[in-house]
């Protein structure tokens, strides 16, 4: 396994919809064209996995069905979008990639990113 | 280094608006937030809100909702911070901060706005 | 909102003396998320722990911090004469951000 730099902003402050947009890219040492990406959550010590992708260079990123993430790719770079947030999910959300193929296997883990997510305002009972 | 600097001090009418600007150096702009705190005369640090210089979100203190608006130039890495229908009470020094993952950082060196008749 | 509260108000002390300074909020903060600061008149705050006890950058070992949950800790092992200021605890853990009424350390 050798290690690979991975650079995600230090801060993120999601939309008022709860939707979080960031760029995880990595240092590829190689020519990847298999490549893993998984999100995974810190918070209060625990770390949970958000969701995670495997991917061909030049494809679209596929999540699961049910996953709150999509992604596109461009290079080295991974837009990743986080749905569905609510203010609990604060959180610090950290980028790990794989190059797993060919090898040999790079793992690369960024610092995190915190993203800050505000509940909306309720609306006000209005009288029709 | 992080460096943030302010313009400079300001007297302003009540009813009026002033518009604060913060220019960073010494790291990515984008990567991080840029928060608002303000300090009235002999008080404490009161917190008016912050943007995300990545995709230029905001999140504004609920006493300050509607007359206040934070923006950034990416550009030029610089942030403002626009405060309308001044009032008297409105009378502090701003600072802008670097927001980071876990912290506010590095300040800015104040700005003194003064609302006077 | 996370309210958060400091106590004493004012510390008064001589040079060479221990300061313990209280911080407590509302609901619990996790530890990664709690900060200090210092700040002296006509100066802008300085940071002096993040994550309740990480000191920052080119901040003396004298200064510590402690804590978990609502209640946090700034300690000074040994005043100087430079550290006589105000003292704020903050949060970042929850929107909005807030801070402390702060803790002034005079001589006393």
């Known amino acids: 396994c050798k290690a690979m730099h991975v650079a995600q902003p230090a801060v993120v402050l999601a939309s008022s919809r709860g939707i979080a947009s960031f760029v995880c890219e990595y240092a590829s040492p190689g020519k990847a064209t298999e490549v893993r990406v998984t999100v995974l959550r810190q918070a209060d010590s625990q770390v949970t996995e958000v969701c995670a992708a495997t991917y061909m260079m030049g494809n679209e990123l596929t999540f699961l069905d049910d996953s709150i993430c999509t992604g596109t790719s461009s290079g080295n770079q991974v837009n990743l979008t986080i749905q569905g947030l609510r203010a609990m999910d604060t959180g610090l959300y950290i980028c790990k990639v794989e190059l797993m193929y060919p090898p040999p296997y790079y793992l690369g883990i960024g610092n995190g990113t915190q993203i800050y997510v505000i509940d909306p305002e309720p609306c006000p009972d209005s009288d029709f | 280094q992080v460096q943030l600097v302010q313009s400079g001090a300001e007297v302003k009418k009540p009813g009026a608006s002033v518009k604060v600007s913060c220019k960073a150096s010494?790291?990515?702009?984008?990567?991080?937030?840029i928060g608002w705190v303000r300090q009235a005369p002999g008080q404490g640090l009161e917190w008016m809100g912050w943007?995300?210089?990545?995709?230029?979100?905001?999140n504004y203190a609920q006493k300050l909702q509607g007359r206040v608006t934070m923006t950034t130039d990416t550009s030029t890495s610089t942030a403002y911070m626009e405060l309308r229908s001044l009032r008297s009470d409105d009378t502090a020094v701003y600072y802008c901060?670097?927001?980071?993952?876990?912290?506010?950082?590095?300040w800015g060196q104040g700005t003194l706005v003064t609302v006077s008749s | 909102e996370i309210v958060m509260t400091q106590s004493p108000a004012t510390l008064s002390l001589s040079p060479g003396e221990r300061a313990t300074l209280s911080c407590r909020a509302s609901?619990?903060?996790?530890?990664?998320?709690l900060s200090w600061y210092q700040q002296k008149p006509g100066q802008a705050p300085r940071l002096l722990i993040y994550?309740?006890?990480t000191r920052a950058t080119g901040i003396p070992a004298r200064f510590s911090g402690s804590g978990s949950g609502t209640d946090f800790t700034l300690t000074i092992s040994s005043l100087q004469p430079e550290d006589f200021a105000v003292y704020y605890c903050?949060?970042?853990?929850?929107?909005?951000?807030?801070f402390g009424p702060g803790t002034k350390v005079d001589i006393k």
């Open positions: 901060a670097r927001v980071g993952g876990a912290t506010i950082d590095y």
């Open positions: 010494g790291y990515t702009f984008t990567s991080y937030g």
């Open positions: 943007i995300s210089a990545y995709n230029g979100n905001t």
């Open positions: 609901q619990s903060v996790s530890s990664s998320y």
């Open positions: 994550g309740a006890s």
């Open positions: 903050q949060q970042d853990y929850n929107l909005p951000f807030t």
